[in-house]
Amino acid sequence: SEVEYRAEVGQNAYLPCFYTPAAPGNLVPVCWGKGACPVFECGNVVLRTDERDVNYWTSRYWLNGDFRKGDVSLTIENVTLADSGIYCCRIQIPGIMNDEKFNLKLVIKPAKVTPAPTRQRDFTAAFPRMLTTRGHGPAETQTLGSLPDINLTQISTLANELRDSRLANDLRDSGATIRIG
């Protein structure tokens, strides 16, 4: 079954996928596709890497992590409701039927409508809580809704962990990780 990730309309969505190269520089081709992973390749390819670089992508899809270290997590820019669905991350390990396939479900929620604040209104109630992470670019934030399902008792722990490291690394276990070699 797919791991579920959420984002709001207008946000950037983040779909984690990782592998560990056998040695530095030994990159494995990866494809991302819209739709569940088929037997071979990716259907409806939105982004592809080879042994050297990112060699194909479509508008709004990009890799914001260090793909040369195996972080091939997908960023989808400025999502709309139409971006909801299953995405396939396929680590194309050389050899017959060696590929690792991961299906990730993206759920897009309508943007929260925040009424004009009235006097004496509690400020925090008007805005979704946000966790800001370093290393994601200028003023990029990720709302709790974009994270895999977590309960509220985990939030303070998660916030502390996020303080000094990238969101992608802290969420590695809830994404797709494979060791190569």
Epitope: P24, G25, R52, D53, N55, L63, N64, G65, R68, K69
Partner: antibody, heavy 121, light 107 residues
């Protein structure tokens, strides 16, 4: 220590070819892509292409694809870049450069001293 | 090809000044931006890779930031030996492309 030593300056006539060499030492030659970059007088840097010595796989900038050939000789740890059908606007300093993650994921980046190629009738 | 737009093309600052150069990619390149320093008659020297990582042996007054399409290179306190031309380069998708360069001079 890592060194990339390039061949000497060349003067060529329009239409001729030039072959620049780059001898590597101080690292495992086959582990890293060898890039070729050029710089016309007073201008910026332009990537020509690269080659991975372990299997000879190369990737060229579309702009040079029909005129350039990159090769390597692993026995001497030397890379070569040949540019054909030279024009006056090919006058530039040509650099070999190697970069990428090395052991323990330390970034590896070294450049040759450059080879001036002058194309003039 | 991904275009890299670097600004300003030249600047003049005093010793000790904070100097900032920006580089804008025509499409997102994640973290894959490098910054080089080149002095006249010399080969380029890597200062920053992967947008924010300082290359070995590079003084800590040099730093980089950004991700996606917008990147910044900063010299926190300009020194006389920093007079050079600085280039950004994307390493996300080949052909690897460079910015047009920024010539830094002392006032």
């Amino acid at each position: 220590q890592v060194q990339l030593v390039q061949s000497g300056a060349e003067v060529k006539k329009p239409g001729a070819s030039v072959k620049v060499s780059c001898k590597a030492s101080g690292y495992t030659f086959t582990d890293y892509y060898m890039n070729w970059v050029r710089q016309a007088p007073g201008q910026g840097l332009e990537w020509i292409g690269d080659i991975i010595p372990n299997n000879g796989g190369s990737k060229y900038n579309q702009k040079f694809k029909d005129r350039v050939t990159m090769t390597t000789d692993t026995s001497t740890s030397t890379a070569y870049m040949e540019l054909r059908s030279l024009r006056s606007d090919d006058t530039a300093v040509y650099y070999c450069a190697t970069w990428g993650y090395g052991s323990s994921y330390r970034w590896f980046d070294y450049w040759g001293q450059g080879t001036l190629v002058t194309v003039s009738s | 090809d991904i275009q890299m737009t670097q600004s300003p093309s030249s600047l003049s600052a005093s010793v000790g000044d904070r100097v900032t150069i920006t580089c804008l990619a025509s499409q997102p390149i994640g973290i894959w931006l490098a910054w080089y320093q080149q002095k006249p008659g010399k080969s380029p020297k890597l200062l920053i890779y992967a947008a924010t990582s300082l290359a070995d042996g590079v003084p800590s007054r040099f730093s980089g930031s950004g991700s996606g399409t917008d990147f910044t290179f900063t010299i926190s306190s300009l020194q006389p030996e920093d007079i050079a031309t600085y280039y950004c380069q994307q390493l996300y998708s080949s052909p690897w492309t460079f910015g047009g360069g920024t010539k830094v001079e002392i006032k």
